[in-house]
């Protein structure tokens, strides 16, 4: 009996430019002889339905149809037919199929590969054209993929123990696509500093599929107006 097992859940997520290993494990009732077996990896793009050969291994012959693609013959002996792709790009997302032949048996498995790019976040103060005591804070998130992103603003006053989500005077612009396929977006918070308590901490919170924990940038309103003491948490997907 020949069986192939891929990543549990059927989806693998990897960061852009990472050296990704797409898992494929072979289960066979007898010890594997790599000279009499074959491995072929196929890829089907998200945008069109045509399947393309990425890598093949037959006996002493192996060929990479995607530069740098490799299946380790040494690991193959112990049933690991995982495909390593260095410097993965956004356009390489899609369905990967691992096909194993141990004559006369054949088995296959598929996995969806999602390529994500983590946003970088920065906080800017824009006072151009603003009235006295009125400030505009801009939270710029750039270089992220996929497009879906959630930007919220929170504040924590001196007295109250937990943050409060701010919904008024927040405008989040449209996402803009970059040349490399990643996206940028800016969210703006308008504040009337004369109406706010000194010591109140404001925070721009960015949530994205690529992040384990939200990306936070904050500033504190001081008695002498405001201090942009930006702290960024960049605990990205790994």
């Amino acid at each position: 009996d020949l069986k192939v097992e891929m990543m549990a859940g059927g989806t693998q997520i990897t960061p852009l430019n990472d050296n990704v290993t797409i898992f494929c494990n072979i289960f066979y009732s007898q010890p594997l002889n790599i000279t009499s077996m074959g491995i072929t990896w196929f890829w089907k793009s998200l945008t069109f339905d045509k399947e393309v050969k990425v890598f093949e291994f037959f006996g002493d012959h192996q060929e990479a149809f995607r530069p740098g693609a490799i299946v380790s013959p040494w690991r193959l002996k112990s049933g690991d037919a995982s495909l390593r792709l260095p410097g993965i790009q956004l356009e390489e997302a899609g369905e990967y199929r691992c096909e194993v032949v141990v004559t006369p048996l054949k088995a296959q498995g598929t996995v969806q590969l999602e390529v994500v790019a983590s946003p970088a976040s920065r906080l800017l103060l824009d006072q151009v054209g603003m009235k006295e005591n009125e400030d505009k804070y801009m939270c710029e998130s750039s270089g992220f993929y996929p497009e879906a992103i959630n930007i919220t603003w929170e504040k924590q006053t001196q007295k109250f123990p937990h943050p409060i989500e701010i919904s008024e005077d927040v405008i989040t612009g449209p996402t803009i696509k970059n040349m490399d396929g990643t996206f940028n977006v800016t969210s703006c918070l308008k504040l009337n500093s004369s109406q706010e308590d000194p010591g109140t901490v404001y925070q721009c919170v960015v949530r994205h599929a690529s992040l384990h924990t939200p990306l936070r940038s904050n500033f504190t309103l001081t008695a002498a107006r405001h201090s942009l003491s930006e702290t960024e948490k960049t605990d990205n997907f790994s």
Partner: antibody, heavy 117, light 107 residues
Framework: QVQLQQPGSVLVRPGASVRLSCKAS????????MNWMKQRPGQGLEWIGG????????DYNEKFKGKATLTVDTSSSTTYMDLSSLTYEDSAVYYC??????????WGQGTTLTVSS | DIVMTQSQKFMSTSVGDRVSVTCKAS??????VAWYQQKPGQSPKALIY???NRYDGVPDRFTGSGSGTDFTLTITNVQSEDLTEYFC?????????FGAGTKLELK
């Protein structure tokens, strides 16, 4: 990292008074507000009151007015809570809690007050 | 004062199960609700703020929901370390008030 140090336990007689302390470190002490909480076994948590750590403002739960008095010593970064005319009902764990420099609240380990004759 | 009611003092669950702890406010508190976990002999630890936002470092099996007067803390795939007590807290106004707590125990 914010740390709030409280004595582990205190034993007092009924009718007496007691001063509980809470020493803060790891953040800009005078900038913040310190709350005090009471927890009796099986009775949930109660907010007693709070004090602005520069000492210029306090706020109390009506239920604890006359029972608790909050003060602060900025030189030692310590907040105090005085409890007067102690009864058995005052036996509880008392926590100090603050916001600190970062989002979220921080709690001391709590002081177990036992009122017993 | 705003009264926070946790109607179930105890709830039975098993490791791997999904469990929902509920809390009801006596008046509209918007989303100004936090959830705390308290293990025996320890001080409470905040898990959720603004009704549904997880604090950093809190496992994603903890989910908060609700607004207005009805709030829920859901734990999916309950772990043995989750079998402890949970409190809700409103922070829309002083005095801050808490629910009486719900203790999760093994079925």
């Amino acid at each position: 990292q914010v740390q709030l140090q409280q004595p582990g336990s205190v034993l007092v007689r009924p009718g007496a008074s007691v001063r509980l302390s809470c020493k803060a470190s790891g953040y800009t002490f005078t900038n913040y507000w310190m709350n005090w909480m009471k927890q009796r076994p099986g009775q949930g948590l109660e907010w007693i009151g709070g004090i602005y750590l520069n000492g210029d403002s306090t706020d109390y739960n009506e239920k604890f007015k006359g029972k608790a008095t909050l003060t602060v010593d900025t030189s030692s970064s310590t907040t105090y809570m005085d409890l007067s005319s102690l009864t058995y009902e005052d036996s509880a764990v008392y926590y100090c809690t603050t916001r600190g420099d970062y989002f979220g609240d921080f709690w001391g380990q709590g002081t177990t007050l036992t009122v017993s004759s | 004062d705003i009264v926070m009611t946790q109607s179930q003092k105890f709830m039975s669950t098993s490791v791997g199960d999904r469990v929902s702890v509920t809390c009801k406010a006596s008046q509209n508190v918007g989303k100004y609700v936090a959830w705390y976990q308290q293990k025996p002999g320890q001080s409470p630890k905040a898990l959720i703020y603004s009704a549904s936002n997880r604090y950093d470092g809190v496992p994603d099996r903890f989910t908060g929901s609700g607004s207005g007067t009805d709030f829920t803390l859901t734990i999916t795939n309950v772990q043995s370390e989750d079998l402890t007590e949970y409190f809700c807290q409103q922070y829309i106004s002083y005095p801050l008030t808490f629910g009486a707590g719900t203790k999760l125990e093994l079925k």
